[in-house]
Interface confidence: low
């Protein structure tokens, strides 16, 4: 998706709904694309992204991607439609209110990704094992 803060606003009298017809407004996410990061060996990190954007589409969720290779560490923050893969991975945890990082297999780098569906939830990315996504207290009940 393109950063929504550069888009023209659309004025109409309709609220977009999800597949079940539930009322949804576009979400707020940190949206700094790819930036260098100092986040390393921590239980959780803040994104240090100063741009909060209204996602382009109501169904989009917040995504954060943490990558480490021999040269640097980057953190990517975006909005993305969970029905579509991102970096070739499905957003399995899109319904979570917290951004719980999960490692993905990528050759030549360490690659973690998380997605979540509460406003600005990709501002705080969580690596700690104590945050287990099977814990119902961390799950936002969404019926897609």
């Amino acid at each position: 998706t393109i950063p929504p803060h550069v888009q023209k606003s659309v004025n109409n009298d309709m609220i977009v709904t999800d597949n079940n017809g539930a009322v949804k407004f576009p979400q707020l996410c940190k949206f700094c694309d790819v930036r260098f990061s100092t986040c390393d060996n921590q239980k959780s990190c803040m994104s240090n992204c100063s741009i909060t954007s209204i996602c382009e589409k109501p169904q989009e969720v917040c995504v954060a991607v943490w990558r480490k290779n021999d040269e640097n560490i980057t953190l990517e923050t975006v909005c993305h439609d969970p029905k579509l893969p991102y970096h070739d991975f499905i957003l399995e945890d899109a319904a979570s209110p917290k951004c719980i990082m999960k490692e993905k297999k990528k050759p030549g780098e360490t690659f973690f990704m998380c997605s979540c569906s509460s406003d600005e939830c990709n501002d705080n990315i969580i690596f700690s094992e104590e945050y287990n996504t099977s814990n119902p207290d961390l799950l936002l009940v969404i019926f897609q």
Epitope: S9, N11, F25, Q27, D119, L140
Partner: antibody
């Protein structure tokens, strides 16, 4: 603590206009969708209008379309409801509420204390 | 519009009683169902959202269940501060609609 304080209610003649305000404090107003919900005397609750966090999307219940307009000023942490062509059946306590928001949490919470609008000649 | 019907419209109960209020939607609303409590002259207060999720700060004696068209709010042991009117609300489709309310009175 979170506070929503409505003002602007009062007695108005049929066909008249009123502008309600809801001053918000205790949470980051610009991040959240907001709604107006009304309650006629001795009756139940009726959702009236909603506006997205940025203010670029609005939605009204059919009975007020073309007469009521919801807006917000994120720099002032204030929600508004402009009510024109008022009718006797618009008489109610009008509540502002945080909600009708993204992420599946489609509920109203918290609410203001309400402001009474009476339409009568 | 989706119609929400609560029953009973009022009930009398004593402190310590188990109280059950039902809400029926005119069509399936999945689990997009919220419950509110309102006391006279006050604003409504959210109790339960998404049919069964307890809102932060709400006592655990309140619980919600159901999906589709039939929903239940249960107060396991009625307390003096629970005497109020309770409303269900669907957020499955616009406009969001409320039930007519159930008034819980002291027996």
């Amino acid at each position: 603590q979170v506070q929503l304080v409505e003002s602007g209610g009062g007695l108005v003649q049929p066909g008249g206009s009123l502008r309600l305000s809801c001053a918000v404090s205790g949470f980051t107003f610009r991040r959240y969708a907001m709604s107006w919900v009304r309650q006629a005397p001795g009756k139940g609750l009726e959702w009236v209008s909603a506006i997205s966090a940025s203010g670029d999307r609005t939605h009204n219940t059919d009975s007020v379309k073309g007469r009521f307009s919801i807006s917000r000023d994120n720099s002032k942490n204030t929600l508004y409801l402009q009510m024109n062509s008022l009718r006797a059946e618009d008489t109610a306590v009008y509540f502002c509420a945080k909600g009708l928001a993204a992420s599946g949490k489609n509920f109203f919470d918290p609410w203001g204390q309400g402001t009474l609008v009476t339409v009568s000649s | 519009d989706i119609q929400m019907t609560q029953s009973p419209s009022s009930l009398s109960a004593s402190v310590g009683d188990r109280v059950t209020i039902t809400c029926r939607a005119s069509q399936s609303i999945s689990s997009y169902l919220n419950w509110y409590q309102q006391k006279p002259g006050k604003a409504p207060k959210l109790l339960i959202y998404a049919a069964s999720s307890l809102q932060s700060g709400v006592p655990s004696r309140f619980s919600g269940s159901g999906s589709g068209t039939d929903f239940t709010l249960t107060i396991s042991s009625l307390q003096p501060e629970d005497f109020a009117t309770y409303y269900c609300q669907q957020s499955y489709s616009t406009p969001p609609t409320f039930g007519q309310g159930t008034k819980v009175e002291i027996k």
